[in-house]
Amino acid sequence: ISYDSPDYTDESCTFKISLRNFRSILSWELKNHSIVPTHYTLLYTIMSKPEDLKVVKNCANTTRSFCDLTDEWRSTHEAYVTVLEGFSGNTTLFSCSHNFWLAIDMSFEPPEFEIVGFTNHINVMVKFPSIVEEELQFDLSLVIEEQSEGIVKKHKPEIKGNMSGNFTYIIDKLIPNTNYCVSVYLEHSDEQAVIKSPLKCTLLPPGQESESAESAK
């Protein structure tokens, strides 16, 4: 492989590590859009025991601009020293490096969810993977936000055990014939910035007179 000395430093790439559906996904963007690599290779080592850089098998000669590191990066304490190489054919266009600490740099994407509206309640079905490794729980709690007519209510369901498998939460005591919107997100124990899901909305069906009167009480 030829190495054309690039005018590029570590600043030429921006990286982002996200927990997406409880998978650790590293994604990257190039700041200079005139450079178009045909493929990338991702390598890393651990700072506490620096060894030769290890190529991530499923991210060697990849055309994607992201890499699933769930099975590689386990520790929330370690510094993962990461090198991304960009190629055009056999020529190395650039090499970027960045250090990641999952405890600090991980952002938490909201889980997938569905809502079903009934007369005076909404079923929120949150989809978690069937198995989630302990290290990937990150002291996270699930938050479900209910919005109606400018009023926002936060629900923090207690999930027994790990966040795994599908989870259903009922938002009750709602008013029939009213529009409700729901957003879900994962909140970290130290209150770092959250990524809220897009709103999903439903107009509850009108209830019978007696039921409407009950709900209005």
Partner: antibody, heavy 118, light 112 residues
């Protein structure tokens, strides 16, 4: 050799704010975390938070939420801790420390004394 | 938060004699990555802290081998085989396994 040089002591009024700096030298600044620790006079140590200078990502102790903002300037290899709405409880010596992994704190700055008094 | 309890509060020693400091945590410090993030530091009077031991038993470079760290789970010990004058000061254990990191209250090593 690795050095963390902190800014000089500060005497400030209650209700104001202060910015403590920690200039790193002798190593690649963006390859390590900077952690911050508080020590009140004659007391033990209290962990405030940490920053990854490479990404700007931070993680803070809830106890200091709303009180402390951590930043870093890669060009000058300097980390900063901004303390706001100061009260007498904030009078302390503040240390920065370098970490290769979370909680390592292998090198410490000399400390910056902040005194809040009217 | 994890509570780190150090004993004794003060340790009065004679130069050349051994010393032992205990540190107990309110929860196991064994992390899911298999490591135990328990460290020891020394703060000499009027100075900034200096790390002596990390990951329970690993000595920092330049730290004399008269210092040893041991323990697991919730119980940890720092031992000095023969105390020297430069060892005087306050010793702190701290844990980084659980967020937030927490320090022990300190043990003052002084001359008898």
């Amino acid at each position: 050799q690795v050095q963390l040089q902190q800014s000089g002591g500060e005497l400030v009024r209650p209700g104001t704010s202060v910015k403590v700096s920690c200039k790193a030298s002798g190593y690649a600044f963006t390859n390590y975390l900077i952690e911050w620790v508080k020590q009140r006079p004659g007391q033990g140590l209290d962990w405030i938070g940490m920053i990854n200078p490479g990404s700007g990502g931070t993680k803070c102790n809830k106890k200091f939420k709303g009180k402390v903002t951590l930043t870093a300037d890669k060009s000058s290899s300097t980390a900063y801790m901004h303390l706001s709405s100061l009260t007498s409880d904030d009078s302390a010596v503040y240390f920065c420390a370098r970490s290769g992994w979370v909680s390592a704190m292998d090198y410490w700055g000399q400390g910056t004394s902040v005194t809040v008094s009217s | 938060d994890i509570v780190m309890t150090q004993t004794p509060l003060t340790l009065s020693v004679t130069i050349g004699q051994p010393a032992s400091i205990s540190c107990k945590s309110s929860q196991s410090l064994l992390d899911s990555d298999g490591k135990t993030y328990l460290n020891w530091l020394l703060q000499r009077p009027g100075q900034s802290p200096k790390r002596l031991i990390y990951l329970v038993s690993k000595l920092d470079s330049g730290v004399p081998d008269r210092f040893t760290g041991s323990g697991s789970g919730t119980d940890f010990t720092l031992k000095i085989s023969r105390v020297e004058a430069e060892d005087l000061g306050v010793y702190y254990c701290w844990q980084g396994t659980h967020f937030p990191q927490t320090f022990g209250g300190g043990t003052k090593l002084e001359l008898k």
